[in-house]
Amino acid sequence: ELPKPYISSNNSNPIEDKDAVTLTCEPVAENTTYLWWVNNQSLSVSPRLQLSNGNRILTLLSVTRNDTGPYECGIQNSESAKRSDPVTLNVTYGPDTPIISPPDLSYRSGANLNLSCHSDSNPSPQYSWLINGTLRQHTQVLFISKITSNNNGAYACFVSNLATGRNNSIVKNISVSSGDSAPGSSGLSASGSGSGLNDIFEAQKIEWHHHHHH
């Protein structure tokens, strides 16, 4: 009787757009056919997927966040067929360019400023806020009550993923008016993958590590 197959992986935590993953259907069995399923469907042809060793080895040449699976392999001969338990890949990715909400750039004096930052990332990113280049706090949400014109400036949300080793950021230039003008729409906010703001963050390293302000 055929044994129940199982999948071994050379990398269970691959990084998106960087790592290749090799899934091997074990054990080696004579006179058998090896089959693969992804998301409960038979393997479809893709330039990023490679089968080798008589279909026993499945290689994902460059993983993406959509390649989590589950993956199953099967073995069959003329008498019987067996299928493995599913295996899911924990693909680490991001952080993507963050989004700050709400999108308003103009605020009235005396209003509360309540900004939330979100970036798609696995694992969940580490969020920090900088105002005019100075670290404010290590949180996803930034709240400042009763803002004045002193709160004008560049509000940067910086996100970091220690698993991928990647950073990302976005800057919003916020203005506070003393008049009765309505809040402005989002306009344009600058974003970058670390590069645009790296000088600011490098310059703030001592403050980042040792001078946490509230």
């Epitope: 694992p123 969940s124 580490q126 920090s128 706090q137 949180t139 996803q140």
Partner: antibody, heavy 120, light 107 residues
Framework: EVQLVESGGGLVKPGGSLKLSCAAS????????MSWVRQTPEKRLEWVAF????????YYADTVKGRFTISRDNAKNTLYLQMSSLKSEDTAMFYC?????????????WGQGTLVTVSA | DIQMTQSPASLSASVGETVTITCRAS??????FAWYQQKQGKSPQLLVY???ILAEGVPSRFSGSGSGTQFSLKINSLQPEDFGTYYC?????????FGSGTKLELK
């Protein structure tokens, strides 16, 4: 100065209920994700529950799931832990803690703790 | 769940000495790792996060290192206020877990 002050602990019988509170001051409470962490009589630290800054996401340790409920009132700068169906193994010092970074961050600030004793 | 194995369980040292505490994670946690200090009758205090970043106000005689599964905390030139219990913890998502602690005592 950052301050987290827990209250509501005490002696309760097995099967009983208790509600813990944590009053925050000295920082923007509504911006911070919060957790409850407990320390057993053997001095082991155990994470209990997590709530995001605006309460939209909550997570629990398997040992308390279905029995404990974490909540917060940002207008009152207060975090809560409602505990029911208490067991003797829930006896511990309960701390509230504020996170850096959220679910991928450490416990940056801790309260002084409130003692919960579950005993017949 | 990720298990954190801390060693030694206790350690005796004298003022001025250098000591190292280690912690092992049961799986790769990258640098999502923290150290805490707890003194008798007090709550834990954050010392190090992201494996090597010193928390605000922590003296430079403390240093954290490691990534992946192996981590260590080194205390150079021990001071009287450094004695207490040290805990490691991963912050690589939920559930967070702690090591069992290392009690650092005065020799």
């Amino acid at each position: 100065e950052v301050q987290l002050v827990e209250s509501g602990g005490g002696l309760v019988k097995p099967g009983g209920s208790l509600k813990l509170s944590c009053a925050a001051s000295g920082f923007t409470f509504s911006s911070y994700d919060m957790s409850w962490v407990r320390q057993t009589p053997e001095k082991r630290l155990e994470w209990v529950a997590f709530i995001s800054s605006y309460g939209g996401r909550t997570y629990y340790a398997d040992t308390v799931k279905g029995r404990f409920t974490i909540s917060r009132d940002n207008a009152k700068n207060t975090l809560y832990l409602q505990m029911s169906s208490l067991k003797s193994e829930d006896t511990a010092m309960f701390y509230c803690a504020a996170h850096y970074f959220g679910t991928s961050g450490p416990f940056a600030y801790w309260g002084q703790g409130t003692l919960v004793t579950v005993s017949a | 769940d990720i298990q954190m194995t801390q060693s030694p369980a206790s350690l005796s040292a004298s003022v001025g000495e250098t000591v190292t505490i280690t912690c092992r994670a049961s799986e790769n946690i990258y640098s999502y790792f923290a150290w805490y200090q707890q003194k008798q009758g007090k709550s834990p205090q954050l010392l190090v996060y992201n494996a090597k970043i010193l928390a605000e106000g922590v003296p430079s005689r403390f240093s954290g290192s490691g990534s992946g599964t192996q981590f260590s905390l080194k205390i150079n030139s021990l001071q009287p206020e450094d004695f207490g219990t040290y805990y490691c913890q991963h912050h690589y998502g939920i559930p967070f877990t702690f090591g069992s602690g290392t009690k650092l005592e005065l020799k």
